[in-house]
Interface confidence: low
Amino acid sequence: GELETSDVVTVVLGQDAKLPCFYRGDSGEQVGQVAWARADAGEGAQELALLHSKYGLHVSPAYEGRVEQPPPPRNPLDGSVLLRNAVQADEGEYECRVSTFPAGSFQARLRLRVLVPPLPSLNPGPALEEGQGLTLAASCTAEGSPAPSVTWDTEVKGTTSSRSFKHSRSAAVTSEFHLVPSRSMNGQPLTCVVSHPGLLQDQRITHILHVSFLAEASVRGLEDQNLWHVGREGAMLKCLSEGQPPPSYNWTRLDGPLPSGVRVDGDTLGFPPLTTEHSGIYVCHVSNEFSSRDSQVTVDVLDPQEDSGKQVDLVSAS
């Protein structure tokens, strides 16, 4: 007769491992008992369990509650056992020794491999600001057995670097993603992808990038100077900028306080019916936690009467 087993049995941490051992004998041969032992090199064999044809299953105290026979119906020549809830310490060599009648004793070895799926964690780097050089955007760490693969999935241009730390029964892999921050990266996803034979599908953790910036400020509203004349209603200046975090706006007048009746509404400066008193230099001050910007414009309110008077003078002068 001979023993049928597997060279390697692979399970995921927490799963039940079936350790196969089947005696294929000649007719009339009987299996008296099957002894299972841990048989790692450099250590004495440690008994796991013994299946006795008369007395049933005996389990070592170290494996109490964790070793069972497969559910019925059972073949009397089948010495397989179930190792419940495999942990990584179970990984190693196992020996099945079958005592038969009348053929004697047979033994076989198998290796149990316990896959430890990684539980990845993603840690964002320091705050990203436009103008910085190459900066750590995020690091992703996953520990497992065997060592997991850690990669990045993103549309953002950057560089990656990985390092691995080996432990006695596992390996931790850390991958870092570096980039040169720019405002176009705002809101872009950066996804850490962890692959491992113990995972049914890749694990993905997504981090949304936030890049602090403040655009140059500009003022709109003076495109047609002829519209800025005495008596005009609804005149306004609008300050244009953008930033992350969103900026706040402040209006001042460089050559004195804001004239009465001028309304500040966030990025907009609203004027009452224009008078020459509204002529002056106006400054829009834009700021966020990252930076601040100024933009100034000169408002010159035309007085039609003054202009027509000048024209008359010119005519009379000729």
Epitope: S121, L122, N123, S170, I205
Partner: nanobody, 122 residues
Framework: QVQLVESGGGLVQPGGSLRLSCAAS????????MGWYRQAPGKQRELVAT???????NYADSVKGRFTISRDNANNTVYLQMNSLKPEDTAVYYC????????????????WGQGTQVTVSS
């Protein structure tokens, strides 16, 4: 030694909500994974949801979209928000947490709570 104590169970009508809490007697910062299992009468204990120290979550297919696991390290508490409850959610819910062994090796030390009963019935 960390002790886990569940609360928040009770009787609720189908479609209702419950929020289970799991308070730890010690810090959960060292907890690698924390989660909730449940065991219905005559059935095997099954995993409901887990959450890693980094906040990544995993759910059993049967509760996806209905249950939400969260964790408050500052208050040493893990929560399970259960919405749209069904009669088949009736079970004893157990909180669990595991710690990595020395130097990050995988020889998990697992802690269990005593469980809290959730009954979904009209």
């Amino acid at each position: 030694q960390v002790q886990l104590v569940e609360s928040g169970g009770g009787l609720v009508q189908p479609g209702g909500s419950l929020r289970l809490s799991c308070a730890a007697s010690g810090s959960i910062f060292s907890m690698n994974v924390m989660g909730w299992y449940r065991q219905a009468p005559g059935k095997q204990r099954e995993l409901v949801a887990t959450i890693t120290s980094g906040g990544s979550t995993n759910y059993a297919d049967s509760v996806k979209g209905r249950f939400t696991i969260s964790r408050d390290n500052a208050n040493n508490t893990v929560y399970l928000q259960m919405n749209s409850l069904k009669p088949e959610d009736t079970a004893v819910y157990y909180c669990t947490g595991d710690q990595l062994g020395p130097l990050g090796t995988f020889s998990p030390i697992v802690y269990w709570g005593q469980g809290t009963q959730v009954t979904v019935s009209s």
